[in-house]
Amino acid sequence: GSGIFQLRLQEFVNQRGMLANGQSCEPGCRTFFRICLKHFQATFSEGPCTFGNVSTPVLGTNSFVVRDKNSGSGRNPLQLPFNFTWPGTFSLNIQAWHTPGDDLRPETSPGNSLISQIIIQGSLAVGKIWRTDEQNDTLTRLSYSYRVICSDNYYGESCSRLCKKRDDHFGHYECQPDGSLSCLPGWTGKYCDQPICLSGCHEQNGYCSKPDECICRPGWQGRLCNECIPHNGCRHGTCSIPWQCACDEGWGGLFCDQDLNYCTHHSPCKNGSTCSNSGPKGYTCTCLPGYTGEHCELGLSKCASNPCRNGGSCKDQENSYHCLCPPGYYGQHCEHSTLTCADSPCFNGGSCRERNQGSSYACECPPNFTGSNCEKKVDRCTSNPCANGGQCQNRGPSRTCRCRPGFTGTHCELHISDCARSPCAHGGTCHDLENGPVCTCPAGFSGRRCEVRITHDACASGPCFNGATCYTGLSPNNFVCNCPYGFVGSRCEFPVGLPPSFPWVA
């Protein structure tokens, strides 16, 4: 503790100029004071002034008023500093002396004589209020006041609490009257050294180094650090924890960049045709009658469906067609015959069967021939059986589909995975992506097809924590950590969902 006992001398009256021994001073009593402050004693005794002592220069002759003086000799109030916890009780002895000698340092002069003395014993609390008193004896009167105040930076009832206001990284505070800390705005904690972050800043995912700031820990973003950062390269996905890539509906693949719903997202099929999804970026258009092409974008001739039967020839008209029938046939599609089996109407070895009591007939055609009169060679490609832009080819009694790259199956209906050819070397994992296959390489290899052996293995130093698996070749950093459940971060170094006191990393 540390404080000051202050004594203010106000007026001394010694009208007759007398000493304590009854003698008078000549020419008058040139008066100075000796003050002794000590611990409380029920009966004041001689001995050391345990709390301090002080003397004044000559302040006046016989009777005088003592003016306040802040510096130099004759300072008033008198200061008695102490470096201990103020006990709350004290004993004070004030002696008035006459000196025939030096005004400024009468204490050292020989022949000094006591004029009078007073003794005060009691309790005194620390405070700014002066306690005023007056002591009389038969010859003199002394008016004075006194108090105990704490030294600078000391506080409390006994001046025992040291507190120094500060505003640096070890504290941002002022001192209360009792010595406790009062944090400056924006700061908190026992020593006011912890900044109060931006209101709403996520307790675990954000932090601050000064008030009203919100700095995000790795894997988090947003003004309040409450939005996770998805995996680098995540196209159509979101995250609930950092570095995740949970695909939006209709998207797939490691980076959610493979379109599983091409039909809905791109509407590739034209002219009212039906679109069917078939794997990543795969689709098939089923055309309405009168349209053809991969996207049903090509309008067919009205005669393309060969509507005229029995060898009738078809002529396109503005919104329809017209059939020119051969001899012996009539009707919109030349479907009615005036011939009978007697006219040998069946070509290419077809057998004629009479119908309706011989008034009409039906031809039974040999293989590879069709038509009412077996007049047409069978074209197995007319039904557009090849999907995904495959080319149809007649091969004798059958037909085959010649598929475009990336498709297979009898009707080219199957999408071939780019990964089926196992393009990744050295045990790399293949991912079908929009622009071709992408390889995730095992430790020690890189390149588009994991064909390059890495002399310095980015995973060799074990950069991934908490049992995470390390992959190279997926990111510009040369490695990617695949975190186990319960951990996040670019190196899987952060546990998920720890209590607020957990010391996160910046």
Epitope: R166, H169, F170, S209, A506
Partner: antibody, heavy 121, light 107 residues
Framework: EVQLQESGPGLVKPSETLSLTCTVS??????????WGWIRQPPGKGLEWIGD???????YYNPSLKSRVTISVDTSKNQFSLKLSSVTAADTAVYYC?????????????WGQGTLVTVSS | SYELTQPPSVSVSPGQTASITCSGQ??????ASWYQQKPGQSPVLVIY???KRPSGIPERFSGSNSGDTATLTISGTQPMDEADYYC?????????FGYGTRVTVLG
Amino acid sequence: EVQLQESGPGLVKPSETLSLTCTVSGGSISSSSYYWGWIRQPPGKGLEWIGDIYYTGSTYYNPSLKSRVTISVDTSKNQFSLKLSSVTAADTAVYYCAREDVILRGGSDYWGQGTLVTVSS
Amino acid sequence: SYELTQPPSVSVSPGQTASITCSGQRLGDKYASWYQQKPGQSPVLVIYEDSKRPSGIPERFSGSNSGDTATLTISGTQPMDEADYYCQAWDRDTGVFGYGTRVTVLG
């Protein structure tokens, strides 16, 4: 018992960058009660405070060295580091790392044993 | 920039009291720390917060700080107290050390 250990090259060429690391053992560098500082002492001379860092990455530097100093922290390794660029012979000194305690009003209660760095070609 | 001034040297006889001063503008309004450094060793904190002793520091070491001066007092000085002593304070966010005082124990 907390221990601090400095490590790094003992010889650096003029104009190059001095790099030192302090490894903390026996306690977490992520405690909110401490800052982690660097102090140096040229041969036969007094102590000079270089700068310090909090576990969150907040740094404070001696204004006379600020343009050349970078202090960083790696909480996963319980380490903090010093980089001093464009060194000259005047940067030859014993470099200490120390723990500055908020509770001790910034007093440094634990020090490394120091490492002598000589700047010479 | 803020400076702390110490006397270069102080000599004391064994068993006597050594006082080392540290002066700086309004130093009493800052917290002063004191460090002891023996040759070839790292500094050791002997006083913090003006007058408090860390555990393990003998009672003969005491400190005070008011006005412009902080003082480290070694009462009953022993030969083992011979060392360099540095005062330290914080000026805003910068640590400042005094120039150091060599304490020599005579005899």
